[in-house]
């Protein structure tokens, strides 16, 4: 028989999405046991039928990768988890409506920081996603978000920072003191979707000025 409250077996069914990798996660409830098994279904918003996710049927782990199944950027999705205990009790819980564009969070960018004598160059590498274009290429975040830009900061000392920003991939902070350590932080910003990545940080030291030796 079904428990009085599904939360006894199953809790916190939700999508966790980062850079468009969409993972369904959940927790067992207070009456869940290690031998409770979970089966996952998903559907596109507006569709009637649920589709069983292959590889996520009667599993004991508490996550299921639905990246491929929820990979259309223009669609909205639901997923649901059915938990069945060793004693035959079952409970089903559904996610809130999921939009990868809206809900995905952004990881820090991949950046190369290059020291020079009086400047520090920062090269941002475009971030790939699991989403494939019609030609088979993986889309980058830049392909998906028109408004994506990079915000770069260089901590010169405790009271002074230099800022750069834009949609370019190459930046350079000029007018720095040779043989000095600086802390750089680089973030991805997407204002339209109110997204901001955690910062990539690089601690770099300008090169010594050999011209005076």
């Amino acid at each position: 028989h079904a428990p009085e409250d599904p939360s006894d077996l199953l809790q916190h069914v939700k999508f966790q999405s980062s850079n468009f990798e969409n993972i369904l996660t959940w927790d067992s409830g207070p009456e869940g046991t290690p031998d409770t098994v979970y089966s996952i279904e998903y559907k596109t918003y507006g569709e009637r039928d649920w589709v069983a996710k292959k590889g996520c049927q009667r599993i004991t782990r508490k996550s299921c990768n639905l990246t491929v199944e929820t990979g259309n950027l223009t669609e909205l999705y639901y997923a649901r988890v059915t938990a069945v205990s060793a004693g035959g009790r079952s409970a089903t819980k559904m996610t809130d409506r999921f939009s990868s564009l809206q809900h995905t969070t952004l990881k820090p960018p991949d950046v190369t920081c290059i020291s020079k004598v009086r400047s520090i160059q920062m090269i941002v590498h475009p971030t790939p996603t699991p989403i494939r274009a019609g030609d088979g290429h993986r889309l980058t975040l830049e392909d998906i978000f028109h408004d994506l830009f990079y915000h770069l900061e260089l901590q010169v000392n405790r009271t002074y920072q230099m800022h750069l920003g834009g949609k370019q991939r190459e930046y350079e902070f000029f007018g720095l003191t040779p043989d000095t350590e600086f802390l750089g932080t680089i973030m991805i910003c997407v204002p339209t979707w109110a997204k901001e990545s955690a910062p990539y940080m690089c601690r770099v030291k300008t090169l010594p000025d050999r011209t005076w030796t």
């Epitope: 950027l73 989403i131 274009a133 019609g134 030609d135 290429h137 889309l139 392909d143 998906i144 028109h146 408004d147 830009f149 915000h151 800022h163 750069l164 920003g165 834009g166 949609k167 370019q168 991939r169 190459e170 910003c189 204002p191 339209t192």
Partner: antibody
Amino acid sequence: EVQLVESGGGLVQPGGSLRLSCAASGFTFSSSWMYWVRQAPGKGLEFVSVINTRSGITHYVESVKGRFTISTDNAKNTLFLQMNSLKSEDTAVYYCATRIQGLIDYWGQGTQVTVSS
Amino acid sequence: DIQMTQSPSSLSASLGDRVTITCQASQSISSQLAWYQQKPGQAPKLLIYGASRLQTGVPSRFSGSGSGTSFTLTISGVEAEDLATYYCLQDYSWPLTFGQGTKVELK
């Protein structure tokens, strides 16, 4: 050398349709953001639409939504703007432009669209 | 949509004058602002991007400053070839929007 060449403009009656083309060369067309920008006679500049040629993601300015459709033929390095239900206020020079290395720095020479009865 | 308010709408300058054009955004756009120059019958030409960075090949008499909501384009000594219309553009969020333009004429 980056080149953008627009074509397809002309005189059309209100309610009519027109399809603009922009032939692109000198850069990687299949992974770029491409724009249509217009300029009404004696007026300022207005971004009309944008498309990412790899993802197919599109955006439109509110005044043309439901009437204009931006698209590409990546095999032919060509950008299109299908304009339906044209109004007199759509009369303008239409430029295509592209973003290269983060900057909207390359523009075509423009094609004139006149909507008049 | 973000509104860009540019002023003045026109100005008369003598050759060698210092000219300042301002642009105000209706909300913060960080440093996502560009300045373009347009001459009659031509497409716009990029002068400044990132609010203050000079595009390659643009004379150093052009400079830009500002961040957030308030921006300025300065021509330190106007030359005959600078007589044109100047537009600011916010490149922060779609729809990208231009200012109304400033026509720089000869006094």
